[in-house]
């Protein structure tokens, strides 16, 4: 640093900045001796409004410094990211967002929870926003799952009427023929592959509605499909086997107590779908009157031993291998209770005793042509042999 | 030599989304300095739009905060400016460039019209 | 926002002379201001930073001065070359704000 020029008149004697310190320190700077600047941990050098990574000024032949002296500022975060379906709260002071201020995030309580963290963060001395996890992006808030105002826990015949509430991840699917499906988090619907197979090279086709209980009401929420995703295993009349397909929507929907998704089923799931145990079915498919109901109806019924189910279907005019390990199967020996024709698509749900969320653990799919015959079933795609597919899908797009 | 060199579509429709690019040759984004994008109106009124740091940390113009992002991709020392919700008030020659303007690129005309 | 007012929008000058480009801060921005010069067709060229400091290869018959709220840009022994537009810029705070320039023309 030291370049003893006789010529040349010492520079200015640098004073740095507050919040900052000088190097190196000596008693004068002549020609081509230099200092930089570096400030303390949470300030940055700024000159002006225009941060920078590092400064040095070199002392020039006239005497002056080549830079001028920048500053060292509290490092600013800015405001916060804005959370959808969510606040976020300045815990530190009103609009603070400076190095070591803290805010907390949080999620529309009942029908959103908050992913990822606790939704702390810090503003860290890189500038950034920082969860205690280290995570620079703002959390998410996810829709409740499997909420429902039923207390007790699709071709609907011999069901009875839905209330507000009751299956508010019920979605209607209009466009072809009348089907349905089930809502998952805010912007997917999980459907039959057999009941969207003919739109699904024309998604925007699909008119699909939300929120709805009588099924010609103009009091609905509306969404538009962006995306279908059909089943690579599924085979247009060859059988139900795959019967499962995906819509993906062009926008989120927001969350109520009339719109709100059903959960997929965790791992444990099977405990509460043995043989016996009691699976709902809603639709707006035909009633024992032989029509479309106008009105959501539902349907409580048990499943179906595998096997008993299978050799129900291998009787003519069936023929065997209908009834795959993809599928299960509900509905009364007697008869008189089952899902039919419009309730294709729907979710066969099911109570999870120890969350108290309902899950879908089948999804509409084929049955007897006469619904609720006796010693038939409906059949229904075994969907926890796709959470997989489902969870890659949506993953991904 | 520092160089800037910006590029993108020449031509958008009203209400579509415009993302710029601007190529960086001879100095690294990360190493120093903010990275600007400023634009210049028929009339020669110049604007500034906002700057991404060497860390990665921006500041927007007010006046565009809704609409505005600036994002940078350091593997190939690219800054990026997307702007949404575009309107015919929106063409203008837009420039990138380092710090107070020491470094300006050649600058790349925008036209909003349907 | 700190408007920059440069009140003259045109300056006539003859090559030789001295012309001094002003420019006025509606706040004190300290020194963060900049000027700049522009070519038809091309894009601007810093001259001057932090009020004062002239940017690398910057002939020096282009010198700035000023802090706070008034600043000038002076050019002594104008040149053919030096007719063109300049703008001031203040980048002392959000947003960075020019002037509206001042076109540079021979008498």
């Known amino acids: 640093h030291h370049h003893h020029h006789h010529a040349s008149q010492p520079c200015p004697y640098p004073m740095a900045p507050p919040n900052g310190h000088l190097s190196p320190v000596q008693a004068k700077y002549i020609l081509k001796d230099s200092f930089s600047i570096f400030c303390e941990p949470g300030y940055e050098l700024l000159q002006g409004h225009l941060p920078l990574k590092s400064f040095a000024a070199v002392c020039q032949k006239d005497g002056s410094w080549d830079q001028p002296m920048p500053s060292c500022s509290i490092v600013d975060c800015g405001p916060p990211d804005d959370l959808p379906s969510g606040r976020v709260e300045y815990i530190t002071g009103p609009e603070v967002t400076t190095y070591k201020a803290v805010i907390q995030y949080s999620c529309e309580e009942t029908f959103y929870t908050m992913k990822v963290n606790d939704g702390k963060y810090v503003c860290e001395a890189d500038g950034f926003w920082t969860s205690s996890k280290g995570e620079r992006s703002p959390p998410v808030c996810e829709p409740v799952c499997g909420l429902s105002a039923r207390t007790t826990g699709g071709r609907i015949y011999g069901g009875q009427k839905a209330k507000p509430g009751d299956f508010p991840w019920q979605v209607l699917i209009l466009g072809g023929s009348t089907a349905a499906g089930a809502l998952l988090y805010d912007n997917w619907v999980l459907t039959a592959a057999h009941a969207i197979y003919e739109q699904k090279h024309d998604a925007s086709s699909l008119d699909i509605r939300l929120g709805a209980l009588k099924r010609l009401s103009p009091h609905y929420t509306q969404a538009w499909a962006e995306a279908v995703f059909i089943h690579e295993g599924y085979t247009h009349d060859a059988g139900f086997d795959n019967d499962i397909a995906l819509i993906k929507l062009n926008n989120k929907v927001v969350i109520n107590s009339n719109i709100t998704p059903i959960c997929l089923p965790r791992k444990e799931a099977e405990s509460f779908m043995r043989t016996d145990d009691i699976g709902t079915a809603s639709g707006w498919g035909l009633t024992q009157r032989g029509l479309l109901a106008r009105n959501l109806m539902y349907v409580d019924i048990p499943i179906v031993d595998h096997q008993k189910c299978t050799a129900a279907y291998e009787k003519p005019p069936y023929s065997g291998g209908s009834v795959t390990a993809n599928m299960l199967c509900a509905g009364l020996e007697s008869g008189g209770k089952d899902s039919c024709r419009g309730d294709a698509g729907g979710a066969l749900v099911f109570l999870d005793n120890e969350t108290q969320r309902w899950f879908v653990g089948g999804i509409v799919s084929w049955g007897s042509m006469n619904c609720g015959e006796a010693g038939q079933y409906g059949v229904y795609t075994k969907v926890i042999n796709y959470i997989p597919w489902i969870k890659n899908i949506i993953s991904n797009f | 030599d520092v160089q800037l060199q910006e590029s993108g579509p020449g031509l958008v429709k009203p209400s579509q989304s415009l993302s710029l690019t601007c190529t960086v040759t001879g100095y690294s984004i990360t190493s120093d300095y903010a990275w600007n994008w400023i634009r210049q109106f028929s009339g020669d009124k110049l604007e500034w739009m906002g700057y991404i740091s060497y860390s990665g940390s921006t500041s927007y113009n007010p006046s565009l905060k809704s609409r505005i992002s600036i994002t940078r991709d350091t593997s190939k020392n690219q800054f990026f400016l997307h702007l949404s919700s575009v309107t015919t008030e929106d063409t203008a020659t837009y420039f990138c460039?380092?710090?107070?303007?020491?470094?300006w690129g050649h600058g790349t005309t925008l036209t909003v019209s349907s | 926002d700190s408007v920059m007012t440069q009140s003259q929008k045109f300056m006539s000058t003859s090559v030789g002379d001295r012309v001094s480009v002003t420019c006025k801060a509606s706040?004190?921005?300290?020194?963060?201001v900049a000027w700049f010069q522009q070519k038809p067709g091309q894009s601007p060229k810093g001259l001057i930073y932090?009020?004062?400091y002239r940017s690398s290869g910057v002939p020096d018959r282009f010198t700035g001065s000023g802090s706070g709220t008034d600043f000038t840009l002076t050019i002594s022994n104008v040149q053919s070359e030096d007719l063109a537009e300049y703008f001031c810029l203040q980048y002392n705070s959000n947003p960075l704000t020019f002037g509206g320039g001042t076109k540079l023309e021979v008498k």
């Open positions: 932090s009020a004062s």
């Open positions: 460039a380092r710090y107070w303007g020491d470094y």
């Open positions: 706040h004190n921005v300290g020194t963060n």
